[in-house]
């Protein structure tokens, strides 16, 4: 399986979109994992709501978000305030008893702002315009790699 | 109506190889799995395998991987089975079978063939 | 692998009597994802619960499913003498979606 790379910037949202079929996949919640080592288990960070049919309804764990149109076939992550610590690999999943099949896998890269390395003694910014939420900007570039990480339940 | 059908009964050598088929009509044949069971003489159902022709997405059970191949063809609706090599061993009534869903479950298979007696003898 | 053990192995009942089969799986098992199927001689397996609880299309509601985790139960509440057959659990929450061995239901 391809791994798709995505770079956001630090304090800004990252919007991940994981495609499916969506007949394929009528019935079963979707996941997002954090991969633990190239070869580790891949460990929930958050998962749709519980009732299928609701999967629409934003789900958060902390600064993840996620939702799913079930229709089109597009399962929504997005990660918040993007830190350092955010950096890594990660799986979409999708959810089907114990069972848990890999829709794609997602490699995360934090850029530091530039700004973080000069001094902007003078610059100032509204508190409430620093934030970007909500307007999830996917602030990144995306291409595919290949690695031989292997797929995790 | 919604239904799978069987290719006919077969009688092998062993050593020979075999395909045998399961047409699906009545429904979206690529938007269901299919599953194969074998049920040897006298015996209980085993599940061998399961197949999403759409994509042609595969899952075997480790009792069966490598001893036999699923496969489908969209295009004329139809799933297989198939063997390279049979053994006496692989006598049995095999069944095609669809695996339904619902909204947050799964319905089980509730469309079965008929069921195809494969006879392996010298 | 799950192991779904079935018992009894035979049940030998009365038309218009109660039949309590169970089956009982060796991890625990999503009752989503549990069903059972009846079988007559010379007949393909026919669905009749899934869900663990939920009655296929056109099955009577004299048959009922229940359970969760690693123990569930079919009832037949009053024995017809079409029931007369063998029946199977299967659990499909994790690959290779196992069947138990069968309970043969047999007129006394």
């Known amino acids: 399986l391809n791994t798709t790379v995505l770079q956001g910037m630090a304090g800004q949202s990252l919007r991940v979109s994981c495609t499916y079929d969506a007949l394929k996949h009528w019935g079963r919640r979707k996941a997002w994992c954090r991969q633990l080592g190239e070869e580790g288990p891949c460990q929930r960070v958050v998962s749709t709501h519980g009732v299928w049919l609701l999967a629409f309804l934003k789900k958060r764990n902390g600064s993840t978000v996620i939702a799913d149109d079930t229709l089109a076939g597009t399962v929504t992550i997005t990660l918040k305030n993007l830190q350092a610590g955010d950096a890594g690999l990660y799986q979409c999943q999708s959810l089907r008893g114990r069972e848990a099949e890999v829709l794609q896998k997602v490699l995360v890269e934090v850029l530091e702002d530039p700004l973080d390395d000069q001094d902007a003694g003078d610059l100032w910014v509204p508190e409430e315009s620093s934030s970007f939420e909500g307007a999830q900007v996917e602030h990144s570039t995306s291409r595919n790699q290949e690695t031989s990480f292997p797929p995790t339940s | 109506e919604v239904q799978l059908v069987q290719s006919g009964a077969e009688v092998k050598k062993p050593g020979e190889s075999l395909k045998i088929s399961c047409k699906g009509s009545?429904?979206?044949?690529?938007?269901?799995?299919i599953g194969w069971v074998r049920q040897m003489p006298g015996k209980g159902l085993e599940w061998m395998g399961i197949?999403?022709?759409?994509?042609?997405?595969?899952r075997y059970s480790p009792s069966f991987q490598g001893q036999v191949t699923i496969s489908a063809d969209k295009s004329i609706s139809t799933a297989y089975l198939q063997w390279s090599s049979l053994k006496a061993s692989d006598t049995a009534m095999y069944y095609c079978?669809?695996?339904?869903?619902?909204?947050?479950?799964?319905?089980?298979?509730?469309?079965w063939g008929q069921g195809t007696t494969v006879t392996v003898s010298s | 692998e799950i192991v779904m053990t079935q018992s009894p192995g035979t049940l030998s009942l009365s038309p218009g009597e109660r039949a309590t089969l169970s089956c009982r799986a060796s991890?625990?098992?999503?009752?989503?994802?549990l069903a059972w199927y009846q079988q007559k001689p010379g007949q393909a397996p026919r669905l009749l619960i899934y869900?663990?609880?939920s009655r296929a299309t056109g099955i009577p509601d004299r048959f009922s499913g229940s359970g969760s985790g690693t123990d569930f139960t079919l009832t037949i509440s009053r024995l017809e003498p079409e029931d007369f057959a063998v029946y199977y659990c299967?659990?499909?929450?994790?690959?290779?979606?196992?069947f138990g061995g069968g309970t043969k239901v047999e007129i006394k």
């Open positions: 079978a669809r695996a339904g869903h619902y909204d947050g479950g799964h319905l089980g298979m509730d469309v």
């Open positions: 009545g429904y979206s044949f690529t938007t269901y799995w």
């Open positions: 197949i999403y022709p759409g994509d042609s997405d595969t």
């Open positions: 991890q625990s098992v999503s009752s989503s994802y």
């Open positions: 869900g663990a609880s």
């Open positions: 299967q659990q499909d929450d994790r690959s290779p979606y196992t």
